[in-house]
């Protein structure tokens, strides 16, 4: 019962997480104009992975897609790739986990097969969540680097007479959605992996059977047979799936305006 609950909950949490990753990827507010130094602006800029938008006080919003591939910064492309990989892996994971659910009966599928599928989907969810978290974090790192770069030369002027305020960008709502969604997918994946252990068939101790050979009275007792799924209580082959925390050694430079239209 606890296994079914853990598996079901893991599925639901992952489903919410993947929906969040998709939402974050599609959102336009990955970076939003920082209003700290210019709170009186009548024009508000925000940017996503696919287009940049401008919202006027008048209520009109104009969005322009990045209709180029080669002209875009490599880091933006990397973030796009990470998010898409996360979505694809998550979607496959969801598909696999549907068939792995203990509460769903598909033909005469054995528990060992369901356990395998549960583990597979769990790993997929973990990698999907890590991809999303990595993508969002790379973008956030670009924003932070850029923010301080643009702060350093905030005001550029012609002889100090005319001031041009450089637009600075800060974290948009999509980043927070992405972080939370990635975390949920990761948690869901871990729950699926935990559930998988409970789904694996336990040790099957076959009862002793007496074989009466002519002239001999020998009782044959086979030893405890372990299911060869690899998910028993055997700790020798236990794998620890490390999230692989990476440190950003290189400072990424990223243009404050990446709407190459």
């Amino acid at each position: 019962m606890a296994v079914t609950a853990c598996q079901g909950l893991g599925f639901v949490v992952s489903l919410i997480g993947i929906a969040g990753i998709i939402a974050a990827t599609c959102m336009d507010q990955w970076s939003t104009q920082d209003l700290y130094n210019n709170p009186v602006t009548a024009v508000f800029n925000y940017q996503g992975l696919w287009r940049s938008c401008v919202r006027e006080s008048s209520g009109f919003t104009e969005c322009r897609g990045y209709f180029t591939l080669l002209g875009l910064p490599a880091m933006l492309q990397a973030v796009r790739a990470l998010m898409i990989v996360g979505i694809v892996l998550g979607a496959i994971g969801l598909l696999v986990s549907i068939f792995a659910l203990k509460c769903i009966r598909i033909g005469s599928m054995e528990d060992s097969a369901k356990a395998n599928m549960t583990l597979t989907s769990g790993i997929m969810f973990i990698v999907s969540g890590l991809c999303a978290i990595a993508g969002v974090s790379v973008f956030a790192n670009m924003l932070v680097t850029n923010f301080w770069m643009s702060t350093a030369n905030m005001y550029t002027g012609m002889g100090g007479m005319v001031q041009t305020v450089q637009t600075r960008y800060t974290f948009g709502a999509a980043l927070f959605v992405g972080w939370v969604a990635g975390g949920l997918t990761l948690i869901g994946g871990v729950m699926m992996c935990i559930a998988c252990r409970g789904l694996a068939p336990e040790e099957t101790n076959y009862k002793a059977v007496s074989y009466h050979a002519s002239g001999h009275s020998v009782a044959y007792k086979p030893g405890g047979f372990k299911a060869s799924t690899g998910f028993g209580s055997n700790t020798k082959n236990k794998k620890i799936y490390d999230g692989g925390a990476r440190t950003e050694d290189e400072v990424q430079s990223y243009p404050s305006k990446h709407d190459y239209v």
Epitope: A42, V43, Y46, E56
Partner: antibody, heavy 118, light 113 residues
Framework: QIQLAQSGPELKKPGETVKVSCKAS????????MNWVKQAPGKGLKWMGW????????RYAEEFKGRIAFSLETSASTAYLLINNLKNEDTATYFC???????????WGQGTLVTVSA | DIVMTQSPSSLTVTVGEKVTMSCKSS????????????LTWYQQKPGQPPKLLIY???TRESGVPDRFTGSGSGTAFTLTVSSVQAEDLAVYYC?????????FGAGTKLEMK
């Protein structure tokens, strides 16, 4: 067609209060912000501020803060400008103007002349 | 506040003449997000409310004759009337639509010789 109809001229004494109305028609009132512009006789245009019809949130120009207030009657598609403690220098024509593309004002009321005289 | 400076303050012209008036802002009105300049031109005739001519510095409002042309970027802008007609005699105002308060220039008065 889009129209902004303002209330008639007002003659007020110093210290009094005046309320100018601006009734909108021909468009969805809630979709566009309403601006107020002052023009003293023979002078240029001065932006007083605007009100977000959707949220009811006003923004006033610094020099007008404290003595003016914008309000709405959404059901009647009407915006109001209230000027308290009138002074002689408040004698002017007050225009309401609806927002458009580029934060421009494509639609204007005909103007309301407010005369402040003892 | 962004200060809008218009020049000249008045212009005396003859019908059919080409006229150019200038508007300068104390800060750039160019928005990096969409590469648009948030500057608007209005025409005001005596006893009438202002009429929108140009927005985004160069986009002509529908119904405005094509003899009116807006140009410029950043802090320097120009309104050109290619061939002045009698009905064009009015005061022309430029306006900052980029940053609050939305300031107007003092105006350029177009007069007949």
């Amino acid at each position: 067609q889009i129209q902004l109809a303002q209330s008639g001229p007002e003659l007020k004494k110093p210290g009094e209060t005046v309320k100018v109305s601006c009734k909108a028609s021909g468009y969805t009132f809630k979709n566009y912000g309403m601006n107020w512009v002052k023009q003293a006789p023979g002078k240029g245009l001065k932006w007083m501020g605007w009100i977000n019809i959707n949220t009811g949130e006003p923004r006033y120009a610094e020099e007008f803060k404290g003595r003016i207030a914008f309000s709405l009657e959404t059901s009647a598609s009407t915006a109001y400008l209230l000027i308290n403690n009138l002074k002689n220098e408040d004698t002017a024509t007050y225009f309401c103007a609806r927002y458009g593309y580029g934060n421009s004002f494509p639609y204007w009321g005909q103007g309301t002349l407010v005369t402040v005289s003892a | 506040d962004i200060v809008m400076t218009q020049s000249p303050s008045s212009l005396t012209v003859t019908v059919g003449e080409k006229v150019t008036m200038s508007c300068k802002s104390s800060q750039s009105l160019l928005n990096s997000g969409n590469q648009r300049n948030y500057l608007t031109w209005y025409q005001q005739k005596p006893g009438q409310p202002p009429k929108l001519l140009i927005y985004w510095a160069s986009t002509r409002e529908s119904g405005v004759p094509d003899r009116f042309t807006g140009s410029g970027s950043g802090t320097a802008f120009t309104l050109t009337v290619s061939s002045v007609q009698a009905e064009d005699l009015a005061v022309y105002y430029c306006q900052n639509d980029y940053s609050y308060p939305l300031t107007f220039g003092a105006g350029t008065k177009l007069e007949m010789k």
